[in-house]
């Protein structure tokens, strides 16, 4: 139904607290450099305006689209050009072009300091002084660093954050109470941010069909007892919600998400028995619970897919008449039967099936052509299974740090043009997948690994698009969303790369490394390792092992020495010469 005033409608649906939070997130995600106080001022103005529209929907400007109201607010900021430069040029455009222009100026890698957590005492003092302001500050700091964070989920994390502080600030040992709780929130929020970023990239770069296919596979795995029609209904709503959030229409997104949660709870009998525990929770927790829901048990009786998708005489007719519905049904049927496969695998299987039908249905004897289609799809299952097995074996053998080093070498060889800090960051992220997934049971390892890799590679692709340096990376990132991971896996040493000249500075260390926290020490060593590979991309594994061993011995010796700096100054050049000789 159409509302006279969209903003009044959303204010009424969401309530003042959530409304203000979402307005703050919207502003912080678009204006990532502005100080908190400036945003608070704008939030209050927008909220007062919304309240006026609730009182009188016919009041001036109340009938305007929310995006237009936000755009007008942003464009009225006097310091816009000096703070944001060419973002101010968007203000010369008319909506919807202005909205698109703002979106293009969102920065996935803003030059902001890391979000440091104050000491528990300081945290609690600030929280007790004004907890609304404190939580607002949390929303602001997270949103400006993660401009695509799923806004209604961020409200959920803010609520969790608030609950943790409420409980722990009364505890005798505040740090012991707070640290594990806040660490858990941070880790989950970072994964949530990456998941939403992949959804937005999927929609923006590969279109609605790609996102819908992803959603069909995921929901079919989670709700294997639901009918395809039910899955399709949810996917349609979910696509609308995700599009709205990715587009910056956060009030609409949060409201429609609430509606979707309500719909799912009203229809839980035909969706999943697991929804029961979610549906008794309050709004934010309910939607979060549904998002994270454990998958339902498989129906006891499911027929073989060959019956409908190979042997049925109407396969080509069904494929020709309603291609997307037919393939959607195939993806649904396959996914609900295979909860242990990753989304990427399922989509590649569906793509393989589609390609086979495209070819065979044009032939004289289609059935003879596609009769063995399922056996022909086997490599799509074998490849990731084998890869996960090999990498988990390597992880078990080397441990997380050693595994990261192996990945640093591997990825530097694949894309040596990428900057050293970026290669180290991704090697570390990829290495942590081993920790997350390799200890899981066999049936969960595969999906855990590939689903996480998809998130990490998506971030790599987003940052690489901003400053492209490698044609191979561009190719893997843009050709196909579902084939990104296999594409990166298939890359080997870049034969076109001209090795970097040797710079002793890259391998020069000082006594300060000895006092660094372990993680920073590792990063420094991994930077040197990547530089080494850029200098000698075809060095053998044995040579690399020797160099790394010498390097570790040198660090140990000098960090144990009485005069550390003298040791580094004296032995450093010797080490560099020895390494050059090893790699010659």
């Amino acid at each position: 139904e159409a509302h006279k005033s969209e903003i009044a409608h959303r204010f009424n649906d969401l309530g003042e607290g959530h409304f203000k939070g979402l307005v703050l997130i919207t502003l912080s995600q678009h204006l990532q450099k502005s100080p908190f106080e400036e945003h608070v001022k704008l939030v209050n103005e927008v909220t007062d305006f919304a309240k006026a529209c609730v009182a009188d929907e016919s009041a001036q400007n109340c009938g305007k689209a929310i995006a237009t109201l936000f755009g007008d607010k942003v464009c009225a900021i006097p310091s816009l050009r000096e703070t944001y430069g060419e973002l101010a040029d968007c203000c010369a455009k008319e909506d919807p072009d202005r909205v698109e222009c703002f979106l293009q100026h969102k920065d996935d890698n803003p030059n902001l300091p890391p979000f440091e957590r104050p000491e528990p005492e300081a945290l609690c003092t600030a929280f007790k002084e004004n907890n609304d302001r404190f939580i607002g500050h949390y929303l602001y700091e997270v949103s400006r660093r993660h401009p695509y964070f799923y806004a209604p989920e961020l409200l959920y994390y803010a609520e969790k954050y608030k609950n943790a502080l409420t409980e722990c600030c009364e505890a005798a040992d505040k740090a012991a109470c707070l640290t594990p709780k806040l660490d858990a929130i941070k880790e989950k929020a970072l994964v949530s941010s990456a998941q939403q970023r992949l959804k937005c990239a999927s929609l923006q770069k590969f279109g609605e069909r790609a996102f819908k296919a992803w959603s069909v596979a995921r929901l079919s795995q989670k709700f294997p007892k639901a009918e395809f029609a039910e899955i399709s209904t949810i996917v349609t709503s979910l696509t609308k919600v995700t599009k709205e959030c990715c587009h910056g229409d956060l009030l609409e997104c949060a409201d429609d998400r609430q509606e979707l949660a309500k719909y799912m709870c009203e229809h839980q009998d035909s969706i999943s028995s697991k929804l029961k525990e979610c549906c008794v929770k309050p709004t934010l927790q309910k939607a979060h619970c549904i998002l994270e829901i454990q998958r339902d048990e498989l129906p006891t009786e499911l027929p073989d897919l060959a019956v409908d998708f190979v042997e049925d005489k109407e396969v080509c007719k069904n494929f020709a008449e309603a291609k997307d519905v037919f393939l959607g049904t195939f993806l649904y049927e396959y996914s609900r039967r295979h909860p242990e496969y990753s989304i990427g695998m399922l989509l590649r299987i569906a793509k393989g099936y589609e390609a086979k039908l495209e070819k065979c249905c044009a032939e004289a004897d289609p059935h003879a052509c596609y009769a063995k289609v399922f056996d022909e799809l086997q490599p799509l299952i074998d490849e990731p299974k084998k890869l996960v097995q090999q990498n988990c074996e390597l992880f078990d053998k080397l441990g997380e740090y050693g595994f990261q080093n192996a990945l640093a070498v591997r990825y530097t060889q694949k894309a040596p043009q990428v900057s050293t800090p970026t290669l180290v960051e991704y090697a570390r992220k990829l290495g942590s997948v081993g920790t997350k997934c390799c200890s899981l049971p066999e049936t969960e390892r595969l999906s855990c690994t590939e689903n996480y890799l998809a998130l990490i590679l998506n971030r790599l692709c987003i940052l690489h698009e901003k400053t492209p340096v490698s044609e191979r990376v561009t190719k893997c990132c843009t050709e196909s969303l579902v084939n990104r991971r296999p594409c990166f896996s298939a890359l080997h040493v870049d034969e076109t790369y001209v090795p970097k000249p040797f710079h002793a500075d890259s391998f020069t260390f000082h006594a300060d490394i000895c006092t660094l926290p372990e993680k920073e020490k590792q990063v420094k060593k991994q930077m040197a390792l990547v530089e080494l590979v850029k200098h000698k991309p075809k060095a053998s594994e044995e040579q690399m092992k020797t160099v790394m061993g010498d390097f570790a011995a040198f660090l140990k010796k000098c960090c144990d020495a009485d005069n550390k700096e003298a040791c580094f100054t004296e032995d450093g050049p010797k080490l560099v010469a020895k390494c050059q000789a090893t790699l010659a």
């Epitope: 498989l298 396959y334 295979h338």
Partner: nanobody, 123 residues
Amino acid sequence: EVQLVESGGGLVQAGGSLRLSCAASGLTFSSYAMGWFRQAPGKERERVVSISRGGGYTYYADSVKGRFTISRDNAENTVYLQMNSLKPEDTAVYYCAAARYWATGSEYEFDYWGQGTLVTVSS
């Protein structure tokens, strides 16, 4: 440890019958779809028949339709293959297999395999 043990194979005249059994242990039998595969000398392993977890759905290769029947007894943790009107081309080693997740009955979906039992059909 999961074990699938086939029995009932042997030498039979063309046109005769055999009943193969596969006893499963070490797994929750009712959570697994079961299948029979066969491999003739010098040929690739092929699927013969499979049955869903509750026994409500079966799938037969064209070459055995109307002659072979699969059934299961979840109380006894056993799956059976009744083979009638046997032909010389049915000669092969027959393998029993179990699949936790099953969509297409392809070989790669099966998690556990038996050692096989030899069926020889003489003309």
